[in-house]
Interface confidence: low
């Protein structure tokens, strides 16, 4: 009773298109596999970034597969051939490992590369992104950006920099089409006459990022004798309400400091009839049925209501 | 009031494949989030597969990367479930699932729990 085996994939590889992080993954049929034309070959692909303690493992059909990476550390990926056991009268077989690595030469120390990258996507609409020059690099150095997410067909430059002594210090980017809910990718590179300058490589998803402005048209209701109902109305912009957390600060006679996270634009509050001052503000974040992080807005304006008598139906300013 | 109905399930080899669909009704809202369920004989809910109807974005769980796909068609208002390979281990019954407060699917093993809408459910057996 011979041993079936099977021998692993060919050619296998990690192929840069040049999208800053995205990857593809891509092998051939193994050898000799003419015993098993009645079957459907499959693979079992294993990929991690160097250094991370877990595999991504995925089983294909198909001669490749994509995913994002990130460019500042190493790729390393291997593939091994399974024949299922409709193929082999029994259990699984599979062959041994094919295993490859993909990694950027760096180029510079690491100081040189760009520091303290921050990215904020302004109400949903408008991405900007800023860092600060390497430590120790001269003044002739200067960063270039390049980013790209699923449906540009090559890396793109930046067009607008923000500029501080003549050098590149962000970027404000371009209307950015169907670009969120999925992986953007940045890479700022840079050049110097006097030293190579080391790369940096970014992933985030913009919706993650997102700053919305900050709430307007504040106003107040009076709903019984102890209850004013606090109001707001959403920024205007391409966010639904649906998306939004509000945090409220309300100050009542200049003591007390009331703070509350509501889902809703309104906010009842319990008050007293010694109550001669009321002030509140509000601020605005995307919440997690949108994203999965962000960033609070800037607080409202603050609204205020002063006077002997705050019974009065509505108090509006 | 959401109306969820699955079907295509049914008997399997292992190394098989079925379709799942689900097709949805009564909902007036267009963004939303819609995914697939399942629960083992015995087990506890296990997320398998989540889609967005405004954005491309489509999650797996670890367990059915690069065998099952999920998909949709606005116009007939249906989801699908594409699943190749069947091991044993995905006999479940398997659960149509719609949020209409998220737009995007958490990449997270416990969202199942935030889905606001189910279907009855449809089993799938794979056995030889």
């Known amino acids: 009773d011979t041993e079936i085996k099977v021998n692993p994939p060919q050619d296998f590889e990690i192929v840069d298109p040049g999208y800053l992080g995205y990857l593809y993954l891509q092998w051939q049929p193994p050898l000799s596999l003419d015993h098993f034309k009645e079957c459907t070959v499959e693979y079992e692909l294993k990929y991690r970034n160097i250094g991370s303690e877990t595999w991504k493992t995925i089983i294909t059909k198909n001669l490749h597969y994509k995913d994002g990476f990130d460019l500042n550390k190493g790729i390393e990926a291997k593939i091994h051939t399974l024949l299922p056991w409709q193929c082999t009268n029994g259990s699984e077989v599979q062959s041994s490992w094919a295993e490859t690595t993909y990694w950027i030469s760096p180029q510079g120390i690491p100081e040189t590369k760009v520091q303290d990258m921050d990215c904020v996507y302004y109400n949903w609409q408008y991405l900007l992104c800023s860092w600060k020059p390497g430590i120790g690099v001269l003044l002739d150095t200067n960063y270039n950006l390049f980013y790209w997410y699923e449906g540009l067909d090559h890396a793109l430059q930046c067009v607008d920099y923000i500029k501080a002594d003549g050098q590149n210090i962000g970027c404000r980017f371009p209307y950015l089409e169907a670009s969120d809910y999925k992986d953007f990718y940045i890479c700022v590179n840079g050049s110097s006459e006097n030293k190579p300058i080391r790369s940096s490589y970014f992933t985030f998803q913009l919706q993650n990022i997102v700053k919305p402005l900050p709430p307007v048209y504040l106003t107040f209701t009076r709903e019984s004798s102890c209850e004013i109902k606090l109001k707001w109305s959403i920024p205007l912009g391409p966010i639904p309400a649906r998306c939004f957390d509000y945090e409220i600060e309300i100050r009542e006679d200049d003591t007390t400091l009331v703070t509350a996270t509501v889902e809703n634009e309104t906010y009842t509050l319990k008050t007293t009839n010694e109550t001669r001052q009321l002030c509140f503000v509000v601020r605005s974040k995307v919440n997690i049925y949108c994203s999965d992080d962000g960033i609070w807005s800037e607080w409202s304006d603050k609204q205020c209501w002063e006077g002997e008598d705050l019974s009065k139906k509505t108090l509006l300013r | 009031e959401v109306q969820l109905v699955e079907s295509g399930g049914g008997l399997v080899q292992p190394g098989g494949s079925l379709r799942l669909s689900c097709a949805a009704s009564?909902?007036?809202?267009?963004?939303?989030?819609m995914g697939w369920v399942r629960q083992a004989p015995g087990k506890g809910l296990e997320w398998v597969s989540c889609i967005s109807s405004r954005y491309a974005n489509t999650y797996y769980a670890d367990s059915v990367k690069g065998r099952f796909t999920i998909s949709r068609d606005n116009a007939k208002n249906t989801l699908y479930l594409q699943m190749n390979s069947l091991r044993p281990e995905d006999t479940a019954v398997y659960y149509c699932a719609m949020d209409s407060r998220r737009v995007t699917c958490p990449e997270i093993s416990t969202m199942h729990r935030n889905f606001d809408s189910w279907g009855q459910g449809t089993l799938v057996t794979v056995s030889s």
């Open positions: 009564g909902f007036a809202s267009d963004d939303y989030i």
